[in-house]
Amino acid sequence: CTCVPPHPQTAFCNSDLVIRAKFVGTPEVNQTTLYQRYEIKMTKMYKGFQALGDAADIRFVYTPAMESVCGYFHRSHNRSEEFLIAGKLQDGLLHITTCSFVAPWNSLSLAQRRGFTKTYTVGCEECTVFPCLSIPCKLQSGTHCLWTDQLLQGSEKGFQSRHLACLPREPGLCTWQSLRSQIA
């Protein structure tokens, strides 16, 4: 299973649920569904209040039980480490795959943390992060922001992911904006 890691704003906008949580239990495989289940302890929720309704406490995250079908394998054994988890809701259960955005909270830049906490949501309705995988790239709409991180190397590598959000500048126009300049 291979997939290009999404821009964190894309991950936020395309997910039903975005939370901060600790992986606290050993994984179990359900003998009927053949899905693997990780026990988690949720510490914060950034998206999904409406989708979840009253069941606002997520205790488990589900993933296919095999790598080749995009199952997520949690490598950290540190049960106190917090992770940002962006996933989909299926039948009220949080599902993730290899292609989901799952990252240690401490590995996120301050700008990304600000994005997940409050800023990315502003761009979800109108704006689209458009991946540029090979040159030349052409914007298909004024609401697209060209994401060129995959083309860059060195100190510029990952700059848009780590520091920028695609946000409305005016109706019908979205641009890259620094998350540093957003009010914390």
Partner: antibody
Framework: QVQLVESGGGLVQPGGSLRLSCAAS????????MSWVRQAPGKGLEWVSA????????YYADSVKGRFTISRDNSKNTLYLQMNSLRAEDTAVYYC???????????WGQGTLVTVSS | DIALTQPASVSGSPGQSITISCTGT?????????VSWYQQHPGKAPKLMIY???NRPSGVSNRFSGSKSGNTASLTISGLQAEDEADYYC??????????FGGGTKLTVL
């Protein structure tokens, strides 16, 4: 009593196709994930494929991926294995088995022999 | 492609105890408590003897026991009897291969 009965095995030429069936009885079929396991003559057991109780999740061994398809019909209490592009190394007794606790196999069929030869 | 390593053969006299090892990796035996053991007599389907490392299904003699240490699981048969002569296979869940079996161990009762 709880029982699994395989059928559909036989002699087939390399590159040919075969569909195995496994009829289940004595338990609520849809509540159990099922699997196919094979055993080449004089050799050990090899896991082939698995399918969840609903049929929504399927898993395959690398050796059969892209050639074999596992499926199930819960209304008929039947498990299937569609085998295409068969090779000599697919020659084996094929068992269907029921997943139980800890992903163990608690119920096995009697097996059906598949021979791939020209 | 055998994922779990078992000795090809072991032997023991009636009344003795024998142990069969099953060595894997941290992604199968070592990573989960999903190790099972099967007994197979010639021409017959395998029979589940141990699941979840050390649990016995009902109807299986308490002479059979299982354990695990690190990446190695073990099946011990105490008070060996003639009818224990068979092939024994270990099996484990593996995140990368889903299900893996050992190559099998032929138990001979002398």
């Amino acid at each position: 009593q709880v029982q699994l009965v395989e059928s559909g095995g036989g002699l087939v030429q390399p590159g040919g196709s075969l569909r195995l069936s496994c009829a289940a009885s004595g338990f609520t079929f849809s509540s159990y994930a099922m699997s196919w396991v094979r055993q080449a003559p004089g050799k050990g057991l090899e896991w082939v494929s698995a399918i969840s109780g609903s049929g929504g999740s399927t898993y395959y061994a690398d050796s059969v991926k892209g050639r074999f398809t596992i499926s199930r019909d819960n209304s008929k209490n039947t498990l299937y294995l569609q085998m295409n592009s068969l090779r000599a190394e697919d020659t084996a007794v094929y068992y269907c088995a029921r997943y139980w606790r800890g992903l163990s196999f608690d119920i096995w069929g009697q097996g059906t022999l598949v021979t791939v030869s020209s | 492609d055998i994922a779990l390593t078992q000795p090809a053969s072991v032997s023991g006299s009636p009344g003795q105890s024998i142990t069969i090892s099953c060595t894997g990796t941290s992604s199968d035996v070592g990573g989960y408590n999903y190790v099972s053991w099967y007994q197979q007599h010639p021409g017959k389907a395998p029979k589940l003897m141990i699941y979840d490392v050390s649990n016995r299904p009902s109807g299986v003699s308490n002479r059979f026991s299982g354990s695990k240490s690190g990446n190695t699981a073990s099946l011990t048969i105490s008070g060996l009897q003639a009818e224990d002569e068979a092939d024994y296979y270990c099996q484990s869940y593996d995140f990368y291969k889903f299900n893996v079996f050992g190559g099998g161990t032929k138990l001979t009762v002398l």
